[in-house]
């Protein structure tokens, strides 16, 4: 018969013969014959293959370097890589998540509009009248003034955008 | 959930050149491989291109080699098919496709990946 110059899907020519692939989590170890099936062997304790193939060598999985602010979200297997995400407190510096910066701190004056993932950074936003943050925080939104009314107080002193207002006590009229 | 959404598809004459765009949406990107599939009416869906995230390893179908380019920006999330010296032969609807997460390396089958956009249509007159 005519040797093929086209193989199935999950198949490729090689000697004019077409060879089944090794499915993922496998590697090539010889190409099938005219009397011999392809050999596959499975990738080895912290190797992959994430597609069916004809390497010889698996791929190593990814380290999650520690010292760049990585840690394992999601351990690899024969037929994935494993995912790296940063450590609490810390965000990707990039979509790869190579390595981790701190979060950002919203200054006094700004207050926290979106809390930073393990992907993305915290958000600030300005306080607006009506509102303060007096702290350096990853966390801390814009608190209200406080309502003198509602104590029965009197604004002595006027609120900031980093500062609460200060209440009083009115002033009695005497007889 | 992932978000696919191709552009960049039109009518353009034999020789002609077109780049379609993938904007990904939905998912962290960089982290995983994307691919180019495409389907001509009353043919079965082909396969066209791929691009994984080690090192930006790239596939390409025997018929496109040498005219279209796999590329990807990941600061818009985006990956791209730039096509050159076009030919009637590659009208059809393309689709960008991604697998998921750990999945890093340019697959071919389509059963390898995991999320799909709806396509768009590149038709090449003669």
């Known amino acids: 018969p005519e040797p093929p110059t086209a193989c199935r899907e999950k198949q490729y020519l090689i000697n004019s013969q077409c060879c089944s692939l090794c499915q993922p989590g496998q590697k090539l170890v010889s190409d099938c014959t005219e009397f011999t099936e392809t050999e596959c062997l499975p990738c080895g304790e912290s190797e992959f293959l994430d597609t069916w193939n004809r390497e010889t060598h698996c791929h190593q999985h990814k380290y999650c370097d520690p010292n760049l602010g990585l840690r394992v979200q999601q351990k690899g297997t024969s037929e994935t890589d494993t995912i790296c995400t940063c450590e609490e407190g810390w965000h990707c510096t990039s979509e790869a998540c190579e390595s981790c910066v701190l979060h950002r701190s919203c200054s006094p004056g700004f207050g926290v509009k979106q809390i930073a993932t393990g992907v993305s950074d915290t958000i600030c936003e300005p306080c607006p009248v009506g509102f303060f943050s007096n702290v350096s925080s990853a966390f801390e939104k814009c608190h209200p003034w406080t309502s003198c009314e509602t104590k029965d107080l009197v604004v002595q002193q006027a609120g900031t955008n980093k500062t609460d207002v200060v209440c009083g006590p009115q002033d009695r009229l005497r007889a | 959930q992932v978000q696919l959404q191709e552009s960049g598809g039109g009518l353009v004459q034999a020789g002609g050149s077109l780049r379609l765009s993938c904007a990904a949406s939905?998912?962290?990107?960089?982290?995983?491989?994307m691919g180019w599939f495409r389907q001509a009416p009353g043919k079965e869906r082909e396969f066209v291109a791929a691009i994984g995230t080690r090192g930006g390893s790239t596939k390409y179908a025997d018929s496109v080699k040498g005219r279209f380019t796999i590329s990807t920006d990941n600061a818009s999330n985006t990956v791209y098919l730039q096509m050159d010296s076009l030919k009637p032969e590659d009208t059809a609807v393309y689709r960008c496709?991604?697998?998921?997460?750990?999945?890093?390396?340019?697959?071919?089958?389509?059963?390898?990946?995991?999320?799909w956009g709806q396509g768009t249509q590149v038709t090449v007159s003669s």
């Open positions: 496709a991604v697998r998921g997460p750990g999945y890093p390396s340019a697959a071919i089958f389509q059963d390898e990946y995991h999320y």
């Open positions: 939905g998912r962290t990107f960089g982290r995983s491989a």
